[in-house]
């Protein structure tokens, strides 16, 4: 807290400019009008204020907007955003994607902070669903964003948004998340032809049921081992040796190197030794 003191004569700020960096904290408090600050927020980022000075500016905005900042101010917060707490952000109503982008830019290159997580949560809840433009923006800044959502939150992703998802966005998703995303991807890509469909659906196959894997095995897709290893164990187990051979095509030889790992080790145990022997890989059930 900065004590309330009268502004020295001639120091009253007429605009937000570089002269303010020479003001002491108490002078900023006394001489900068909060309403002026709010209207000229876009200038703050161009001025090399110290962290202590930024604290004073935040304090002034907090006093002016005790119920939360308006979007016109939020959009121009810039580095002042880093001073905000999740509690502050929960008071905001952010509806513009441009505002979201501006604030994410401030945090760019850093891990998702609690502030950013709260901001995104407020934004997505305000929109009601995770639309394609929002998802595009969020995954551009945070490739792991999608996998940080709960299955319940992912259920609000419309199938149309799936087009924005890149393979690396799904790297850290667990089976429960892929269980939600896979049916949406299937719907989104349903009108594509065989080989194009497989390229698009491949990253989501960790949520695929057995019957879809059986269907893929009939389409000469030549699934690579990395994708096969990410399939749900319970979806792989009912596949026959012939179906796995068709599914993997020339990559079937890779099963030997993965025989100690799930889901391969589970699948091997459930096969007849005679069937495994047809692969000629020396797999022991």
């Amino acid at each position: 807290e900065v004590e309330k003191t009268a502004c020295p004569s001639g120091k009253k700020a007429r605009e937000i400019d570089e002269s303010l960096i020479f003001y002491k904290k108490w002078e900023l408090e006394a001489c900068v009008d909060a309403a002026l600050l709010a209207t000229q927020m876009d200038r703050v980022n161009a001025i090399p204020f110290t962290y202590e000075q930024l604290d004073v500016l935040k304090h002034k905005l907090d006093e002016l907007y005790p119920q939360g900042y308006p979007e016109s101010v939020i959009q121009h917060l810039g580095y002042l955003f880093l001073k905000m707490s999740p509690e502050d952000i929960r008071k905001w109503n952010v509806t513009s994607l441009e505002t979201l982008k501006a604030l994410l830019e401030v945090n760019k290159g850093h891990e998702m902070s609690p502030q950013v997580a709260t901001l995104i949560d407020r934004f997505v809840k305000g929109r009601g669903q995770l639309d394609k433009d929002t998802l595009d923006t969020l995954t551009a800044f945070y490739p792991g964003y999608l996998c940080s959502l709960s299955p319940e939150e992912l259920s609000s992703v419309p199938p149309s948004s799936i087009w924005a998802v890149r393979p690396q966005d799904l790297d850290t998703c667990d089976p429960r998340q892929l269980d939600v995303l896979y049916p949406k991807a299937r719907l989104a890509f349903q009108n594509m032809n065989g080989s194009e469909y497989f390229v698009k659906i491949q990253s989501f196959l960790g949520g695929a049921p057995t019957e879809d894997l059986k269907a893929l095995s009939q389409q000469n897709v030549s699934m690579d081992l990395a994708t096969f290893m990410k399939l749900r164990t319970d979806a792989v187990l009912p596949l026959t040796v012939a179906e796995v051979q068709k599914l993997l095509g020339p990559h079937v030889e890779g099963l030997k190197a993965e025989e100690r790992h799930r889901p391969v080790r589970d699948w091997i145990l459930r096969q007849r030794q005679d069937d495994l022997d047809t692969l000629g890989l020396g797999l022991q059930g």
């Epitope: 667990d174 089976p175 429960r176 319970d234 100690r260 799930r262 145990l269 059930g285």
Partner: antibody, heavy 119, light 107 residues
Framework: QVQLQESGPGLVKPSETLSLTCTVS??????????WSWIRQPPGKGLEWIGY???????NYNPSLKSRVTISVDTSKNQFSLKLSSVTAADTAVYYC???????????WGQGTMVTVSS | DIQMTQSPSSLSASVGDRVTITCRAS??????VNWYQQKPGKAPKLLIY???SLQSGVPSRFSGSGSGTDFTLTISSLQPEDFATYYC?????????FGGGTKVEIK
């Protein structure tokens, strides 16, 4: 309610073979959904997986013990067993039998039986 | 073999505290990591399976997260009955391996 119960001698002499049996009640050892494991815990130490068996008789052992371990299953008695040969004092531990499900976790454990290797 | 390294090996905490235990795998275990609680003289009890799924009957104050090589068990508000030793375990690759354990003691 599936339950597991270990049984076997609590004292084994060095160089002899440790033999334990795990009886499954409330469920079937023949279920294709589970692996049946043995795990041990030396006094005051952590947990060590010994190996598992599938109802078909397929086994998988910890390489550190493989040369001395045999796990077998008797579906008619709804039991699976552990034999550990050439034991030494280092094999003194609480031995647990446990069920591993498709999710890869040991969801059901026996209460454990203490086996001491001493002459 | 995949080595599971748990930290800390022990910690002191008070009732109501938030407690975090971490487990690092020497190579990727994908999401095949489970967490157990063990009390003296008792068998371990499954808390979390597949990195983040809560086992039926386990209180919701327990949660798990992580994938690949780094995993976390969190107890949001420690209760008197939670003082015990906690183990992580990977089931991605044989031999199945456990972490060395974390003993949670009363401060």
């Amino acid at each position: 309610q599936v339950q597991l119960q270990e049984s076997g001698p609590g004292l084994v002499k060095p160089s002899e073979t440790l033999s334990l049996t795990c009886t499954v009640s409330g469920g079937s050892v023949s279920s294709g959904s589970y692996y049946w494991s043995w795990i041990r815990q030396p006094p005051g130490k952590g947990l060590e997986w010994i190996g598992y068996i599938y109802y078909s008789g397929s086994t998988n052992y910890n390489p550190s013990l493989k040369s001395r371990v045999t796990i077998s299953v008797d579906t008619s008695k709804n039991q699976f067993s552990l034999k550990l040969s050439s034991v030494t004092a280092a094999d003194t531990a609480v031995y647990y039998c446990a069920r591993e499900g498709k999710n890869g976790a040991f969801d059901i454990w026996g209460q454990g039986t203490m086996v001491t290797v001493s002459s | 073999d995949i080595q599971m390294t748990q930290s800390p090996s022990s910690l002191s905490a008070s009732v109501g505290d938030r407690v975090t235990i971490t487990c690092r795998a020497s190579q990727s275990s994908r999401y095949y990591v489970n967490w157990y609680q063990q009390k003296p003289g008792k068998a371990p009890k499954l808390l979390i399976y597949a990195a983040s799924s809560l086992q039926s009957g386990v209180p919701s104050r327990f949660s798990g997260s992580g994938s690949g090589t780094d995993f976390t068990l969190t107890i949001s508000s420690l209760q008197p009955e939670d003082f015990a030793t906690y183990y992580c375990q990977q089931s991605y690759s044989t031999p199945l391996t456990f972490g060395g354990g974390t003993k949670v003691e009363i401060k």
